[in-house]
Structures are given as structure tokens and as C-alpha cells.
């Protein structure tokens, strides 16, 4: 599940990883666009074991995965894209 959040909070990620995470371990992906309190885009991966990892947005694997998820959501296949506005 791909989620896009618009938030006025400051940066959430202290450390970012570029290490590949297989899809079977991912519960959802949260995207925090840059702006307001944080000068950079952040990507947070929520894993099935309940742990959370901040992923480097430049990591090739996450870019590829998000592209796949976007394509799936636009062709109405499973794995929906959720966009939530948070004031």
C-alpha cells in the first residue's frame, strides 16, 4: 500500500537506508513530500514485523517499487494508492 501524506510536521527521518527490502516484508509505504517543516522528501517503510525504516528516496529499489505500485493503482489492479491530507 502506497500512502502519500501532506503534513506540517518537521522531518521524521533521522537516518535513511538504501538497503533493499523484499516486498513480502513490507506492509505499507508512506511518502512525505518536502515542504513546510521538512526540506526533503521522506519515504517511510512500515514492515510486517511492525518496525519502521526510513528509505533514501534516491535508492533505486524504492523508486522502482513505487513506479510499479503507481502503475498498478492506475490500472485498477490490487495494491491501491492512498492519499491522505493531514492538516
Amino acid at each position: 500500500v502506497l500512502e502519500v501524506y501532506y503534513t506540517s510536521l518537521r522531518c521524521r527521518c533521522v537516518q535513511e537506508s538504501s538497503v533493499f527490502i523484499p516486498r513480502r516484508f513490507i506492509d505499507r509505504i508512506q511518502i512525505l513530500p518536502r515542504g513546510n517543516g521538512c526540506p526533503r522528501k521522506e519515504i517511510i517503510v512500515w514492515k510486517k514485523n511492525k518496525s519502521i525504516v526510513c528509505v533514501d528516496p534516491q535508492a533505486e529499489w524504492i523508486q522502482r517499487m513505487m513506479e510499479v505500485l503507481r502503475k498498478r493503482s492506475s490500472s485498477t489492479l490490487p495494491v491501491p494508492v492512498f492519499k491522505r491530507k493531514i492538516p
Partner: antibody, heavy 119, light 107 residues
Amino acid sequence: EVQLQQSGPELVKPGASVKISCKASGYTFTDYYMNWVRQSHGKSLEWIGDINPNNGDTTYNQKFKGKATLTVDTSSSTVYMELRSLTSEDSAVYYCAGYDEDHYAMDYWGQGTSVTVSS
Amino acid sequence: DYVMTQSHKFMSTSVGDRVSITCKASQDVSTGVAWYQQNPGQSPKLLIYSASHRYTGVPDRFTGSGSGTDFTFTISSVQAEDLAVYYCQQYYTTPWTFGGGTKLEIK
């Protein structure tokens, strides 16, 4: 120091079953998924499946469904693999190997258990 | 199943040489690739994960690169102890699959 200690070599007859073990020490047992990998003589590696020690959930390579059963005993930090209906094709070295949710690649390996199927 | 192909079963090299081993995936595996070293009579050892990340304690002469379907494992200056079999493995999707191995030999 992380160690995966496997049970000793097995010589079994065709059609029989065998259960091999892998005892973990030196780390938090539930932090690592445990995999089993087969290596036939002089050949490459084949992934059989893995087990999550937290809940016993298993994922199998379709090729080994019905052949291998993975189980875990958290009280002794041991994982087991039972192989049934053995044939000469199952003669191989079987490795247990662990990966955590930092690497996802198998960073700890047992020493291997040799299984020979012969009448 | 995803097939990992190591085109060279054997590669000849000399101590001090730079050597590259290639691995090709039958489908896109992103950067979900690891490289292992196996010495005779021993268990495999993890060298590289996530295509290019060197595992803890692995000498920096070992490097990995690639994404998608084409991957390369390089030893910048081969040492005598590097003569072994090297396997690539994809962990993009189950079943995890390994390449057939490349045996590094002395010329």
C-alpha cells in the same frame, strides 16, 4: 559469537524420512528467519524454504512442498527440517542459514548436514 | 521461478589481477541480489547484499554493482585466499534462487 550448529550426517534408505536440526546461539533467536538450502554434490545451491521463529510461519519453494517440513522449537532455539519419501536425488548437503530484517541475505550459515540416501 | 545465470562456470586469474564475475536475472530483481563465497568443504559466506552493500568485515577489494537484470561482482586485486566458488542469489521474490556458481582458479 553467532553459531548455527547442525546435526550429524545421516545415511538413510530410499522411502524413509529424516529429521535434521539446527541449533542457534549467540543472538536473539527470534530476530532471524531460518532458511534451509540444499547443495547436491558439486552442484549449486537450492533454497528449500524459510521459517519465522516468532510465529512458526513458513514459506516453501514449491519444488520442496510435500518433501520438506520446517518446524521450530523456541524453547531450545532450534529449527528442524524433516525430509520424507527420500530418493537418491535427495542425497546432498543441507544447510541452515539465517537472515535478519536488516540484510535479508543469508549472513549466518550452519556447517551443513550430509544426507545420503542408499539401500 | 526467477533464473539467475552465471555465464562462466570457471574463471582463470592470477594473484593481483582484477576479476569480474557476472550474473544475469531472468526478470527484474531490482537490487535484491547477494553474492556468496564458498571454499571447498565449507559453508557459503555472505560478501555482498542489496547488490552493492559490503557485508560486515568483508575486505574492500570485494565490490558489487548492478540493478534490474545485470549484476557484477568484482575483486579488485585477487589474493590466494579468494580462490573459491562465487554464487549470486536473488531475494526479490520467493523462491529465492541462486546462480550456478563461478569457480575462480589460478592461471
